[in-house]
């Protein structure tokens, strides 16, 4: 069985341009970097920088490359077999439950709390109560109540779109 391709952004149907390489499907599937032709007899290569496929497949079109949003940096470009990898800029993060945009990290913790985790591309700073050690999940405090800290340095991708 082939692995499922889960990327949702799909490129429109492609006609095979002369420069697109063709090969025959194997067991009804085309290799990563290709899609199947409309008659099911050929594998047509994806277009570098435009679209891609990551698994053996019988899709009739390749998947459209993700374009990094403003506020994101491109960690690696789109190839015919891998989608673009985008990451939130330094000082911003993307949460799993709100993946559509990068949000600014808080600059510090509320009074009575201490920072135990830096801002990363995938998480805000982490604060805990000094006494109890319990995590804080409230809103950003007023400026005068914060203990400032410098944002963390991005270390790894926050969103693998491929």
């Amino acid at each position: 069985e082939s692995a499922l391709i889960t990327q949702q952004d799909l490129a429109p149907q492609q006609r095979a341009a002369p420069q697109q390489k063709r090969s025959s499907p194997s067991e009804g599937l085309c290799p990563p970097g290709h899609h199947i032709s409309e008659d099911g007899r050929d594998c047509i290569s994806c277009k570098y920088g435009q679209d891609y496929s990551t698994h053996w497949n019988d899709l009739l079109f390749c998947l459209r490359c993700t374009r990094c949003d403003s506020g994101e940096v491109e960690l690696s470009p789109c190839t015919t077999t891998r989608n673009t990898v985008c990451q939130c800029e330094e000082g911003t993060f993307r949460e799993e439950d709100s993946p559509e945009m990068c949000r600014k990290c808080r600059t510090g913790c509320p009074r009575g709390m201490v920072k135990v985790g830096d801002c990363t591309p995938w998480s805000d700073i982490e604060c805990v109560h000094k006494e109890s050690g319990t995590k804080h999940s409230g809103e950003v405090p007023a400026v005068e109540e914060t203990v400032t800290s410098s944002p963390g340095t991005p270390a790894s991708p926050c969103s693998l779109s491929g």
Epitope: S2, L4, I5, T6, Q8, D9, L10, A11, P12, Q13, P25, E27, G28, L29, I36, S37, E38, D39, G40, H55, N57, D58, L59, L60, F61
Partner: antibody, heavy 113, light 110 residues
Framework: SVEESGGRLVTPGTPLTLTCTVS????????MIWVRQAPGEGLEYIGF?????SAYYASWAKGRFTISKTSTTVDLKMTSPTTEDTATYFC???????????WGPGTLVTVSS | DIVMTQTPASVSEPVGGTVTIKCQAS??????LSWYQQKPGQPPKRLIY???TLASGVPSRFKGSGSGTDFTLTIRDLESADAATYYC????????????FGGGTEVVVK
Amino acid sequence: SVEESGGRLVTPGTPLTLTCTVSGFSISRYAMIWVRQAPGEGLEYIGFITSDSSAYYASWAKGRFTISKTSTTVDLKMTSPTTEDTATYFCARYTYSDGTDLWGPGTLVTVSS
Amino acid sequence: DIVMTQTPASVSEPVGGTVTIKCQASQSISTYLSWYQQKPGQPPKRLIYKASTLASGVPSRFKGSGSGTDFTLTIRDLESADAATYYCQPNSGIATYGAAFGGGTEVVVK
């Protein structure tokens, strides 16, 4: 044309093979699909077999059905039928971009003790 | 597996009326969608493929549209012969994603 055969009354757990016979086109050039329809229900995709004899199944059908083919027929083996498998089973010709364009009349399978 | 959500489950319109059936795919399938008509005791009949291309012999009263994840089948100038159940089915990536049909829409012509 496409025509299914082999449907009958079977007891639960008794393997049953349905056969799809084609004429007027070459099975070696087309994929073939199996679909079923329980009484009063909608169409349910089971799986298909490619022109080069590779079979793929709906996730719910894996292990419950086996699709194979010869030069003129496509078989659907029901490995261990249950009462929920009572349905009319359709075989059809599948083309990648144009869908399922040629259907058989269906064959009725009744699974009952 | 891909999931096809079809609405409404049933619709009733008079002769000469118009019916609109919608089909939504759980992921984009470009324009690779087919529509089928099925009458009781008969196998399905392909009406439309590639979202909008009419199959041979199908009257132009039937119109398919859409791309990506959202598709529509419109039947105008309804005739009594149009009373049937209609199904959508994706055509791209049948081995990759499966080819589940939509749940069907029963069209009753009054």
